[in-house]
Amino acid sequence: QTWYDSLGAINKIQDFLQKQEYKTLEYNLTTTEVVMENVTAFWEEGFGELFEKAKQNNNNRKTSNGDDSLFFSNFSLLGTPVLKDINFKIERGQLLAVAGSTGAGKTSLLMVIMGELEPSEGKIKHSGRISFCSQFSWIMPGTIKENIIFGVSYDEYRYRSVIKACQLEEDISKFAEKDNIVLGEGGITLSGGQRARISLARAVYKDADLYLLDSPFGYLDVLTEKEIFESCVCKLMANKTRILVTSKMEHLKKADKILILHEGSSYFYGTFSELQNLQPDFSSKLMGCDSFDQFSAERRNSILTETLHRFSLEGDAPVSWTETKKQSFKQTGEFGEKRKNSILNPINSIRKFSIVQKTPLQMNGIEEDSDEPLERRLSLVPDSEQGEAILPRISVISTGPTLQARRRQSVLNLMTHSVNQGQNIHRKTTASTRKVSLAPQANLTELDIYSRRLSQETGLEISEEINEEDLKECFFDDMESIPAVTTWNTYLRYITVHKS
C-alpha cells in the first residue's frame, strides 16, 4: 500500500512539474468596459490528450480469450467546449444578468473573466480589477470584521456602508462583541443566511472595477434578498460594473443587459424588453425538446463546482468538506457541505454511464439518499448535484440486489466481481462483459443535460485485461481516514499504464 501511495505521489508531482507555466494575464487598468468577443473555452484540455493516448495504446488490443473484459464505447468527449462563441459588451456602471439552465456555462463565463479558465478562441477585455462572490458562502476563522475586510485596507465609511447594504447591522448588533465576535474555530456558528451575507459583503467591500456575483442570494430569504439587491447591487454598487448570475425575473428586469446561456452558447443577449418580445418564441423552441426541461431546479447551480474546490486534473487532492478552507477557491458553507459534489470534475460530469452485462453480476449498488454525502472515489452514476441522484434506469441495468451499499465500494465490486458482506471476497470470471457507454442512450427517458453537449462523431474503444488484485490495491483506502477523491481520470491512467 505504501508503495502505491508513494508512486501516486511521485506521479502527481511529476505531472505538476510537467504542466505548462501559468501565464499571468495582462490587463489594461484604463479599460472601463467589459468586452467578450467570440470566446470559446474548454475545461481540462489535457484530458483529451490522455484519451488520445489511450486510444492509440488500445487500438488493436483484445483480451486473451477474445472477449472484451472492459471497454468503453462512443467516447466522444474530445472537443466539447464549455463556452461557445460568447459575445457581450457592458459599459462601466452597467449590470449584466446572466441566466441559463444547469450546465449552461454561467460559472464558466465568470471563470473565463477571472482568468481561471483560459479561452481557446476570442478576446476578453477588462481592467483586471475584479471582485468575486461565489455561490458557496464561506467563512474564515476570525472576526466578522476580518471576514469582510479580508486583508484590504480598512475604510470606516466604506465598511459601514457595506454592512448596512448587506443587511448585517441587525445581526451584528445582537452580539455583545459586535463585529469583533469570533467566527469559525472556537467561535460562534452562523446561519446560512448570515454566511451568505458576509460572503457578499466581503466581495462588495473589496474595491474593484468589475464585480462577479455568482448566485449570491441562493440561501437568503426573499425579503432580505430584495433589500440587498436594491440597496447593495443596485444602489451601493451603482457606479460599478456588475455581472450577476441569477434565475430571478425580478433581477433580469433591473439589469441593463441580459445574457442567457444554453449548453455553452449565447441563446439571448439584449435588454429585458427584447427578452419579453422573444419569450414566447423561446418557450416554443425549448419546451419538450431540450434537456433542461427534464431536470429539477436544484440543478440550476453551476456546473463548475470544481473551480471552487480547485482540484487538479487528477482530482486526487485530499479535501475534507467539513473543514473551513483558507483558500478562496476551496469554499464550502453550511449549505455547501450538504451539497452532493457530483461535479467535482466537470469533464466527468458531461457523460452518463450505463452498464450492460452478459451475466448477472452481484453488486451492492449505489446509496443515493443518505443525509450526508460520502466522499466520492469513483462513480459510474453521476449525482443530480444537490442531493437527488439520477439512478440507473431499469432498462439499462438489471441487477437483483437492492441498491443500498456504498457508492465507491459498489463500483470497486462491479469492476472486480467482489461481493461486500463486511469483507472483500474476490472471485474471477470472464463471462461478464461490462459495457460503459459514455454517449447518450437512445432508450433513456431523460437525456442527460451534459450528454447532449457531446459530439457523436468519434468513438473510442479500450479493451484491457485487468489484474484484479492490482486494481483492488489501487483503489484500496480507509473510508474514515482518507478523504481523497479518485476520479475516472486516475482509473483510466491506471489501466493505460499498468498493462498486463
Epitope: S101, Y219, K248, M249, S296, E298, R300, F335, Q386
Partner: nanobody
Framework: QVQLQESGGGLVQAGSSLRLACAAT????????MGWYRQAPGKQRGMVAI???????DYADSVKGRFTISRDNAKNTVYLQMNSLKPEDTATYYC?????????????????WGQGTQVTVSS
C-alpha cells in the same frame, strides 16, 4: 396560473402546537426556495423559516428550536411545524415560493405569495 394556498392556522393556547401547510398549484415546472413569513399587526413582514429545494433550512432567531420547516417536492408543498407557541408568535403567516412556471424557459423564477393564514396564541 400559479397559486399558493396556506392552511392550518387557528387559535391555540400558549405552549401548544400547530402545523401549517402551503400547497403550490398550477402550471409549475419547478420550485426553488420556499418559506414562511409572518406579519404581526403594526409590524413589518419578516422571515420565519426558509427551505431550499434540497432541504437546507434557515430560521429566524426567535423561532429556532421551536419551529421546523419541511417540504414535499413531489406535492409542491411546504410545512411549518410550530411547537411551544408563545403569544408573540401571533401573526398572519404567509407562504412564499420561488417558482418556475411551465411557460418559462431556462428555470427563470418568479416570487409567489399566499394569502396568509392567521395564527393566534392566547396566554
Amino acid at each position: 396560473q400559479v397559486q399558493l394556498q396556506e392552511s392550518g392556522g387557528g387559535l391555540v393556547q400558549a405552549g401548544s402546537s400547530l402545523r401549517l401547510a402551503c400547497a403550490a398549484t398550477g402550471s409549475i415546472r419547478s420550485i426553488n426556495n420556499m418559506g414562511w413569513y409572518r406579519q404581526a399587526p403594526g409590524k413589518q413582514r419578516g422571515m420565519v423559516a426558509i427551505i431550499t429545494r434540497v432541504g437546507n433550512t434557515d430560521y429566524a432567531d426567535s423561532v429556532k428550536g421551536r419551529f421546523t420547516i419541511s417540504r414535499d417536492n413531489a406535492k409542491n408543498t411546504v410545512y411549518l411545524q410550530m411547537n411551544s407557541l408563545k403569544p408573540e408568535d401571533t401573526a398572519t403567516y404567509y407562504c412564499h415560493a420561488e417558482i418556475t412556471e411551465q411557460s418559462r424557459p431556462f428555470y427563470l423564477t418568479d416570487d409567489y405569495w399566499g394569502q396568509g393564514t392567521q395564527v393566534t396564541v392566547s396566554s
